[in-house]
Amino acid sequence: IVKAGITIPRNPGCPNSEDKNFPRTVMVNLNIHNRNTNTNPKRSSDYYNRSTSPWNLHRNEDPERYPSVIWEAKCRHLGCINADGNVDYHMNSVPIQQEILVLRREPPHCPNSFRLEKILVSVGCTCVTPIVHHVA
């Protein structure tokens, strides 16, 4: 198996995905192992308020997706907060985005049938130097 230019050694016991009997679907246990972990990022830390590029957290709920609740960050300011507590527009607040895998109900509204899907979520914001376009 070659992935991203790296050869991954293959276990001879692996099933052959070309085999007509190879399953196209898998069983997934949706009982989360560490369910006690606090899933509300507002409660787990206050970085969203203390950051020099603070953000608001929004509960994104979609019953057709697992997990159904994902918290999305949206930057509060165009600039960043300076030492005086004012917004400095010499810098930009931008979201930190992470691609994650979720399960989407397929067909829709089916309780036990899902398709794997990649989505992009904003997990927080950071402060960057802005891109300056020079006009001729």
Epitope: H58, E72, H77, N92, P95, L120, V121, P130
Partner: antibody
Framework: EVQLLESGGGLVQPGGSLRLSCAAS????????MFWVRQAPGKGLEWVSS????????YYADSVKGRFTISRDNSKNTLYLQMNSLRAEDTAVYYC?????????????????WGQGTTVTVSS | QYELTQPHSVSESPGKTVTISCTRS????????VQWYRQRPGSAPIIVIY?????PSGVPDRFSGSIDTSSNSASLTISGLKTEDEADYYC??????????FGGGTKLTVL
């Protein structure tokens, strides 16, 4: 009453210049982001330019970059748009608008107060 | 930079519910706030929804906003349609470099 009143529109030849003004009243002008938005005849809204409360930073649509300059005089509660090298496609109603907020005042919460607009016609 | 696409026109009868969509071409619809504006002929726009789903004071609760990550779109829903709701509706968002974007607008006709 919170109000924005644009002026300075008119008929100008291609390549000409025009300066639009927007007089603000009823709120603390120096605390708010301000915008210029235009609407060509029969077309949709198009963002033109924005300016931060202090006036120190400005932002422009690619279509006007290098030709238009936004500025403000917080002591006079007035927003300006200097338009140079005007083209036929700049013909539009020009609106000035205020960003929603403070206290949450930021760039990202929409434009909650709009002027009535001033018409700019670029034609020979 | 992304684009916001709206249907050119929608129509519905008085008393019914209508939904206007605003689809983002790239990046997640949830990454940036979406605003909605109403513009009646010959008048300036007014904001009817800000921060995805917040209603300014004075806007009736018949107006609601939402975002849907599966279709990567925002929606404006108007229930109990009235003839006075007939107008052009624009969605708007921004990118983090300071650019403000508007959708092409949707003409709502109340039959």
């Amino acid at each position: 009453e919170v109000q924005l009143l644009e002026s300075g529109g008119g008929l100008v030849q291609p390549g000409g210049s025009l300066r639009l003004s927007c007089a603000a009243s009823g709120f603390t002008f120096s605390k708010y982001f301000m915008f210029w938005v235009r609407q060509a005849p029969g077309k949709g809204l198009e963002w033109v330019s924005s300016i931060v409360p202090s006036g120190g930073h400005t932002y422009y649509a690619d279509s006007v970059k290098g030709r238009f300059t936004i500025s403000r005089d917080n002591s006079k509660n007035t927003l300006y748009l200097q338009m140079n090298s005007l083209r036929a496609e700049d013909t539009a109603v020009y609106y000035c608008a205020r960003a929603k907020g403070p206290p949450r005042g930021s760039y990202y919460y929409g434009m909650d107060v709009w002027g009535q607009g001033t018409t700019v016609t670029v034609s020979s | 930079q992304y684009e916001l696409t709206q249907p050119h026109s929608v129509s519905e009868s008085p008393g019914k519910t209508v939904t206007i969509s605003c689809t983002r071409s790239s990046g997640s619809i949830a990454s940036n706030y979406v605003q909605w504006y109403r513009q009646r002929p010959g008048s300036a726009p007014i904001i009817v929804i800000y921060e995805d789903n917040q209603r300014p004071s004075g806007v009736p609760d018949r107006f609601s906003g939402s975002i849907d990550t599966s279709s990567n779109s925002a929606s404006l829903t108007i229930s109990g349609l009235k003839t006075e709701d007939e107008a052009d509706y624009y969605c708007s968002s921004y990118d983090y470099s300071g650019t403000v974007l508007f959708g092409g607008g949707t003409k709502l006709t109340v039959l």
